[in-house]
């Protein structure tokens, strides 16, 4: 990697990309934007999918964490020949389909959608796009929109989770590179560490969850700390404090020495979870220690 900013969050990332006729001479810039961004999401638990839309939606690459498959997916993305209309809702349908199937497996991984389009959506197409984006949200997704050139920011603010989830690129496609840092910062939700990472068996503790993006939730009241104990039972706790770079959470009482709790965070009241490799373990603490 080039040493630029990276994201260590474990979630499902969907790129929904406009390949309508109006982007014909700018596909390289779109591809390069996605490629740069894809390489910066580096958690082994992060899965990625590439979806393109014009008059119809196509899933170019289904969700995968396999870096070789992602490399092949990027190769296919580079070969896309744009053409057709801007049926953005067809792209969201393809994302919702995958989220639906992933949710059916029981454990629900958080989903982040980054949708890129140029141009304004005609009234009926805007209606369908907003509706399909809402369906993705109902399934637990966080939706970001990147608008390039002649986009309608008001439309995109309704398709995305909020105005703050829209990335306007007013200077044309060549300016896409300039928003990689900000889109990475905003769309990345990651758990980096827990303090303390070792707690006393049988005692109650508070834990500081260090990371990024915890205030990116549509509603910070819906943020939860989640502890997956010994790979089986999951306990959700409401944090005492939610800041962008940390959460203050009550830790569950783990009765026995050697118990492990894997740390997760939900941005939507437990509908789905961001995973991490951060583990809290218990140890024996003698009286007075």
């Amino acid at each position: 990697e080039d040493g630029g900013p990276a994201c260590y969050g474990g979630f499902d990332l969907y790129f929904i990309l406009d390949k309508s006729g109006s982007v014909l001479h700018h596909w390289n810039e779109i591809y390069y934007f996605v490629e740069q961004l894809a390489h910066r999401f580096i958690s082994p638990q992060l899965r990625m999918s590439f979806i393109v839309f014009s008059t119809r939606g196509t899933t170019l690459m289904k969700l995968t964490e396999d870096r070789e498959q992602i490399r092949q997916g990027l190769e296919e993305l580079q070969k896309v020949l744009p053409g057709g209309d801007t049926y953005m809702h067809e792209g969201f349908e393809r994302a919702s389909e995958q989220i639906y199937y992933e949710n059916s497996q029981g454990y629900r991984t958080a989903s982040v959608i980054i949708a890129l389009t140029d141009g304004e959506l005609h009234e009926d197409l805007f209606f369908y796009s907003e509706r399909e984006a809402n369906r993705s949200r109902d399934l637990g997704a966080i939706v970001y929109c990147v608008g390039v050139k002649d986009f309608n920011e008001t439309q995109l603010a309704r398709i995305a989770d909020s105005k703050d989830h829209v990335f306007p690129v007013n200077d044309g496609f060549q300016a896409l590179q300039g928003i990689i840092h900000s889109i990475l910062k905003k769309s990345c939700i990651e758990i980096l560490a827990a303090e303390p990472s070792t707690i006393c068996a049988g005692e109650s503790f508070q834990v500081v969850v260090r990371g990024n993006g915890f205030r990116h939730a549509r509603n910070v009241d819906r943020v939860l700390c989640s502890f997956k104990i010994n790979d089986s039972v999951t306990l959700n706790e409401k944090p005492f404090a939610v800041e962008d770079t940390y959460l203050l959470c009550p830790a569950p009482i783990l009765k026995e020495v050697g118990m492990k709790a894997a740390l997760q965070v939900s941005m939507n009241d437990g509908l789905s979870f961001i995973s991490s490799s951060v583990i809290i373990t218990t140890t024996h603490c003698s009286d007075g220690s």
Epitope: S96, E97, Y101, R135
Partner: antibody, heavy 118, light 109 residues
Framework: QVQLKESGPALVKPTQTLTLTCTFS??????????VSWIRQPPGKALEWLAH???????YYSTSLKTRLTISKDTSKNQVVLTMTNMDPVDTATYYC??????????WGQGTLVTVSS | DIELTQPPSVSVAPGQTARISCSGD??????VHWYQQKPGQAPVLVIY???KRPSGIPERFSGSNSGNTATLTISGTQAEDEADYYC???????????FGGGTKLTVLG
């Protein structure tokens, strides 16, 4: 647990309209992505999808039969109704309703055999 | 509309691996589902979304999807697996569900 049950006439005359009701329990159509499909199977032949309805009352129909089919739902009664006009002996089949999302149908009714004959 | 093509029949010896194919144009960009149907019974979903197994379905059933072919694999095939198998997928462009023509699996012996 999730259950679906088809009901309707076992015998209809040619040119008549068939009305089939699917009564379901154990799930709600208010889940995003969830819906109910109708599928039929003529004796000794393959499955043929007919129609689908979902939470938002979106209705989708088989291309070859769309002029003859109407699907509707009554969420309060947990029922989905299929009507098929201008019945013909070739429409003789077992008609199934099934719960489904995006093309997958994870629970099926037992099916009801409809014979079209004068 | 998309078309899904299956072989009419497949035979396998007990304990061997049975593979049933389902081909269609660019099928790998779609999700394929597989149903088992025994005589006089309603179909049962055995694989959905290419490779996911519903609860209660034995582990010997698995699925894959690449290129223009999706495959249902039954490893260590048992006599009770003898049935008709149908693949299906959702055609987004026409908003309809398409079934393959079905494959009759015969377990020899």
């Amino acid at each position: 647990q999730v259950q679906l049950k088809e009901s309707g006439p076992a015998l209809v005359k040619p040119t008549q309209t068939l009305t089939l009701t699917c009564t379901f329990s154990g799930f709600s159509l208010s889940t995003s992505g969830m819906g109910v499909s109708w599928i039929r199977q003529p004796p000794g032949k393959a499955l043929e999808w007919l129609a689908h309805i979902n939470l938002d009352d979106d209705k989708y129909y088989s291309t070859s039969l769309k002029t003859r089919l109407t699907i509707s739902k009554d969420t309060s009664k947990n029922q989905v109704v299929l009507t098929m006009t201008n019945m013909d002996p070739v429409d003789t089949a077992t008609y199934y309703c099934a719960r489904g999302g995006y093309g997958d149908m994870d629970v099926w009714g037992q099916g009801t055999l409809v014979t079209v004959s004068s | 509309d998309i078309e899904l093509t299956q072989p009419p029949s497949v035979s396998v010896a007990p304990g061997q691996t049975a593979r049933i194919s389902c081909s269609g144009d660019n099928i790998r960009s779609m999700f394929v589902h597989w149903y088992q149907q025994k005589p006089g019974q309603a179909p049962v979903l055995v694989i959905y979304a290419d490779n996911k197994r519903p609860s209660g379905i034995p582990e010997r059933f698995s699925g894959s999807n690449s290129g223009n072919t999706a495959t249902l694999t039954i490893s260590g095939t048992q006599a009770e697996d003898e049935a008709d198998y149908y693949c299906s997928s959702y055609d987004y462009n026409a908003h309809l569900v398409v079934f393959g023509g079905g494959t009759k699996l015969t377990v020899l012996g």
